[in-house]
Every structure is written in C-alpha cells, then in structure tokens.
C-alpha cells in the first residue's frame, strides 16, 4: 500500500469560449481508494478555488460553467490525489480559454452538382459555421476542411477551404455516389468532429477535369 501516483491534467476543451472542461489522468492508486480534487486560481489572484463541477464532464474531470469561465484571465490549476498513505499533486497547468476551443461541427452542409454550359461541371459545397461560435466579435477565425469519397472507397480526399464557407471540386468520378463532410477549427484551437455525411450522386455525363 502506497501513496497515489502523480496525476496529470492532459486535456482542456471549450465548445464556445463560454464554458470549458479539463480532464486528468490518475496516477497509480497505491492499492487504496483515492480521492481527487482539482484546485485553481486565476491570474492576478492568490485565492484558491475548488472545481465547481466534477460531474458534467464525466469521470476525472472538472467542468467550468458560464459563471466560472473568463476569457480574460489565465487559469492556473492542479489536481491533488489523496489516499490513506498520503497525497500527490499534478504539475501546475495554465489555461487560456482562447486556446482550447473545439467547436461543434459546421451546420447546413449542402452539396450540389453544377453543370454550366460554357464551363466544366463541378461539385459545389456550402455550409454554415456552428451556432455557438460568435464570429462577429472578430477574434474567432474559423478554418474549414472538407472530406469526400465515393461511397465504397476506403480513402478520403481532403481539401482545405481556409475561411471560406463554400468550395468547388472539379475532379470527380462520373456515376458515383459520394459522401461529403466538413469540419472546422479556430486557428489556435482544435478540429471539430466531422459534420454528418451528405450524399450526392454524380451524373454519368459529368466530365472529369484533366
């Protein structure tokens, strides 16, 4: 029977900069029941606070709801593991909410085959940013990535769309049914999950671009 091993806070994520959650990995338990507590203070403060919500984020997590989340202040946090034989602390972790945003997937993905008379046909893909992300404030720059593949293919073809919310693809296999998905990330944040797939049938007379 031993004191617990050192825990590690390894992940923090915010869906929209208004709330966030951090997760830790327990160290060894020393063969005894172990209690974990996360304490934090914000830059410029000395007063330590305990995690406001150990439930919402699941096991070994701390969730900071709206009233506990500030974009203006860096959070300094650590996890304490305690059993009957003693305690151990994680390293201190510094968190700036700006840099942990992982948005929801983009919305309203629309895919259409366009066949203009005077130009080569193309696949036109359009989407909207996730609702929880406020792009009007200006500090949020969302970047987008599209992936598509014929229904029975194993490999995805990936296209980086930058900040655009629409994209054209010229090279497609005629007569195939394609799956199309899109995801987004803030410049210094994390990729969202892929949006639900949209299916599109490419007409047999679709001319491949050379």
């Amino acid at each position: 029977q031993l004191p617990p091993g050192k825990p590690e806070i390894f992940k923090c994520r915010s869906p929209n900069k208004e709330t966030f959650t951090c997760w830790w990995r327990p160290g060894t338990d020393g063969g005894l029941p172990t209690n974990y507590s996360l304490t934090y203070h914000r830059e410029g403060e000395t007063l330590m606070h305990e995690c406001p919500d150990y439930i919402t984020g699941g096991p070994n997590s701390c969730h900071f709801g709206k009233q506990y989340t500030s974009m203006w202040r860096t959070y300094i946090m650590m996890v304490n593991a305690t059993n009957q034989m003693g305690s151990s602390f994680s390293d201190e972790l510094y968190v700036d909410v700006t840099y942990i945003v992982q948005p929801d997937p983009p919305l309203e993905l629309a895919v259409e085959v366009k066949q203009p008379e005077d130009r080569k046909p193309y696949l036109w893909i359009k989407w909207s940013p996730p609702t929880l992300i406020d792009l009007k404030t200006g500090w949020f720059t969302l970047l987008y990535e599209i992936r598509l593949k014929p229904e029975k293919a194993a490999e995805w073809e990936i296209h980086f769309a930058g900040q655009q919310t629409e994209f054209k693809i010229l090279s497609l296999h005629p007569g195939q049914k394609y799956l199309v998905q899109v995801r987004c990330k803030p410049d210094h944040g994390y990729w969202s999950a892929w949006s639900p797939a949209t299916f599109i049938q490419i007409p047999s007379d679709f001319t491949m671009n050379d």
Epitope: E8, F10, K11, C12, R25, E43, G44, M71, W72, T74, D91, L93, Y94, V95, D96, T98, Y99, I100, T137, G138, W139, K185, H188, Y190, W191
Partner: antibody, heavy 118, light 112 residues
Framework: EVQLVQSGAEVKKPGSSVKVSCKAS????????IHWVRQAPGQGLEWIGE????????NYNQKFKGRVTITVDKSTSTAYMELSSLRSEDTAVYYC???????????WGQGTLVTVSS | DIVMTQTPLSLSVTPGQPASISCRSS???????????LHWYLQKPGQSPQLLIY???NRFSGVPDRFSGSGSGTDFTLKISRVEAEDVGVYYC?????????FGGGTKVEIK
C-alpha cells in the same frame, strides 16, 4: 518532470538541409503545441513556427515558408524541424519550446547549434 | 511583422539596486479577445531562455517577486526591485498577439 531533449550539433554545407529533433517526456505529448525558435550567434530570438502534435496542424513564420517543415512522430513523442536551402545566415542555435494551453513558452529544449559553412 | 524595441541595450547594476527595462511594440498588442500577450524571458549565460512574466504582469511559477511587469497597448516595462547576482543575463520581451510571434533585441544585465 517535463523535458525537451534536442539532437546534437550539426555542420552543413550551403544549399543542403538539416533536420533537428526534439524528444518530449514527462507529459502527454499530444496535449500541447511545440514551437521552434532560433538564435543566431550574438543575436536575439526569432520564432520559426509551431505545430499541434495532436493533428500536425502548423503555423509558420512567412519568412521561412517554403524552406521549413515542422513535423511530429507521435509514437516517439518527438517533434522535428527541417530547414532546407541552407545559407550561412541560418547558422544559429535552434530551440524547441512547449506551451501550455496558452501561447507562451513555458519549457525550452537545450538548443541545437546548426553551423552552415562551405 | 510586429517590431519589438527594447531599451536600454545593456544595464550594469549594483546588487540590491533596482533595474528597469523598457519594451515598445510597433503596433498595439491588445488581442481582439481583449488580452495582451506580452511576455518576458530571461536567458542566463550558456542556458536556454526561461519564462519570467506572461501577459504583461503575471509571474510564472517559481519566479521571485522581485520581478514585476507592467504596461499596456504598445509600452511595457520589466522591473527588478533588487537585483541579485543570479539575475545576470539577457532579458527579452516577446509578443504572441500577432503571428509571427516576435521578440525584442534583448537587454543585457550585468552586475557592477
């Protein structure tokens, strides 16, 4: 204990490439961005670029774009910085550095001296 | 790119005396999220840089309270209230509000 251990000194010919490694330990490698910064002899610090090891997303200083490639090998918790078309002005100590969930550098490697000379 | 200008270039200080380093940026360092990402690093002789102050005025873990940072917008100052022998080295200000991140030219602090 967080450690960033870099590869040894290199001497290179003008026009060639160099690949410097930075092996991370003491934390979950994919959690935090790795940055590369260089320091020419007797000079100040210059930021080269950064990588998010979780998905290999990179941002580069435009000054080095096209000449620099930053990559990671998650299986060995190692970041790499490759600089091509070397010239004498690239002679410098190259540092890797790690952020937290922030954009400043909390931990630094010991540095790797790259000398470009004919 | 944002140009960071540090003054003075070098500073010779008697132990126990204060020291002050100025850093000026060519553009405001206020991020569109409201934060100011101006930091101070110290590079001791023969060592890698180490973080002293983050976001203008916050001491990093383990940094003695004789170090303090202040300023806003484009003008920033690092103060050492009582210089000690272990404080010798080159001090750099750095901004990470705008990409590419940039550093000042450095201020060398030595003991008289």
């Amino acid at each position: 204990e967080v450690q960033l251990v870099q590869s040894g000194a290199e001497v290179k010919k003008p026009g060639s490439s160099v690949k410097v490694s930075c092996k991370a330990s003491g934390y979950t490698f994919t959690s935090y961005w790795i940055h590369w910064v260089r320091q020419a002899p007797g000079q100040g610090l210059e930021w080269i670029g950064e990588i998010d090891p979780s998905d290999s997303y990179t941002n580069y200083n435009q000054k080095f774009k096209g000449r620099v490639t930053i990559t990671v090998d998650k299986s060995t918790s190692t970041a790499y910085m490759e600089l091509s078309s070397l010239r004498s002005e690239d002679t410098a100590v190259y540092y890797c550095a790690r952020s937290f969930f922030t954009n400043w550098f909390a931990y630094w490697g010991q540095g790797t001296l790259v000398t470009v000379s004919s | 790119d944002i140009v960071m200008t540090q003054t003075p270039l070098s500073l010779s200080v008697t132990p126990g005396q204060p020291a002050s380093i100025s850093c000026r940026s060519s553009q405001s360092l206020v991020h569109s999220n409201g934060n100011t990402y101006l930091h101070w690093y110290l590079q001791k002789p023969g060592q890698s840089p180490q973080l002293l102050i983050y976001k203008v005025s916050n001491r990093f873990s383990g940094v003695p309270d004789r170090f303090s940072g202040s300023g806003s917008g484009t003008d920033f100052t690092l103060k050492i209230s009582r210089v000690e022998a272990e404080d010798v080295g080159v001090y750099y200000c750095s901004q990470s509000t705008h990409v590419p991140f940039t550093f000042g030219g450095g201020t060398k602090v030595e003991i008289k």
